[in-house]
């Protein structure tokens, strides 16, 4: 039984530095508790952007200081990352873990390349 995770190849952040993408997984079992982690890979460095554990049918709850928000629907998680700047451009990888009930399964997506372009500063108006 394999656990496959799909996510879009490329996403462009909007002018406010917000990027959204869907992380979809093919569940080999009937999970009631799922953990979703977003990892950023840049220059062979990996950092955890955010993580949330949720009960199937309930909302994702990220930590209060998290830059991520999200909603879930079935085996699909809609993720939004806020406050991005040009220096945050990179590969954002979705990791999904079926936490409960056992057995545990894990799947990792191929990553979404998020491009962030800092907005041009507005010219001073006289």
């Amino acid at each position: 039984k394999a656990m496959h995770v799909a996510q879009p190849a490329v996403v462009l952040a909007n002018s406010r530095g917000t990027a959204s993408f869907v992380c979809e997984y093919a569940s080999p079992g009937k999970a009631t508790e799922v953990r979703v982690t977003v990892l950023r890979q840049a220059d062979s460095q990996v950092t955890e952007v955010c993580a949330a554990t949720y009960m199937m049918g309930n909302e994702l709850t990220f930590l209060d200081d998290s830059i991520c928000t999200g909603t879930s629907s079935g085996n699909q998680v809609n993720l939004t990352i806020q406050g991005l700047r040009a220096m945050d451009t990179g590969l954002y990888i979705c990791k999904v873990e079926l936490m409960y009930p056992p057995p545990y399964y894990m799947g990792i997506g191929n990553g979404t390349q998020i491009y962030v372009i800092d907005p041009e500063p507005c010219p001073d108006s006289d």
Partner: antibody, heavy 119, light 108 residues
């Protein structure tokens, strides 16, 4: 740097209990699944149990289910293994290991603590 | 439960030679979630490879992993004296996380 230090091993009679501890340092403890892996003398490696992230989810090998309990205290960066109803076949070096960023392989290991179950 | 079988049980080679270790799974290992470890007597295991082919931090490039599905290989291109040890494979795509019985690489 990442460090894992186990303690609590020793000689115990069959049917008795023992509690192992593993103190972690050098990383954000609550962001990782933490595991116990054991190795009987002259034998191979056997995964025992895992306690995930916030501590609420735990999984066990069939060989220890119902007898061993894994727990963690994230405020103390410490992982525990409560071993009850010990048997001779539980004799092994018990390693504390950190799960990896990309999944539950084991990227850092403690030095191990020896548990001997003998009458 | 995924059962892993390693072959050969023992590999007798000389320094400078190439070592090829095999790990076979009883069923497909999800997305190549397979790791390799090295263990020397009296020491804890050390992670060499994860994801079937990604080298862990600080591991020399003479160690390489390959394979997918049910068949995986660890290759040591040129054996150094410090490479003589026992090598284990492990799958981590689903619980219980299982190890192979190990391959001992000893000096011929």
């Amino acid at each position: 740097q990442v460090q894992l230090v186990e303690s609590g091993g020793g000689v115990v009679q069959p049917g008795r209990s023992l509690r192992l501890s593993c103190i972690a340092s050098g990383f954000t403890f609550s962001s990782y699944g933490m595991h116990w892996v054991r190795q009987a003398p002259g034998k191979g490696l056997e995964w025992v149990a895992v306690n995930w992230y916030d501590g609420s989810n735990k999984h066990y090998a069939d060989s220890v289910k119902g007898r061993f309990t894994i727990s963690r205290d994230n405020s103390k960066n410490t992982l525990y293994l409560q071993m009850n109803s010990l048997r001779a076949e539980d004799t092994a070096v018990y390693y504390c290991a950190r799960g990896g960023v990309w999944g539950p392989y084991f990227d850092y290991w403690g030095q191990g603590t020896l548990v001997t179950v003998s009458s | 439960e995924i059962v892993l079988t390693q072959s050969p049980g023992t590999l007798s080679l000389s320094p400078g030679e190439r070592a090829t270790l095999s790990c076979r799974a009883s069923q497909s290992v999800s997305s190549s979630y397979l790791a390799w470890y090295q263990q020397k007597p009296g020491q804890a295991p050390r992670l060499l490879i994860y994801g079937a082919s990604s080298r862990a931090t600080g591991i020399p490039d003479r160690f390489s992993g390959s394979g997918s599905g049910t068949d995986f290989t660890l290759t040591i291109s040129r054996l150094e004296p410090e490479d003589f040890a026992v090598y284990y494979c492990q799958q981590y795509g689903s619980s219980p996380f299982t190890f192979g019985p190990g391959t001992k690489v000893d000096i011929k």
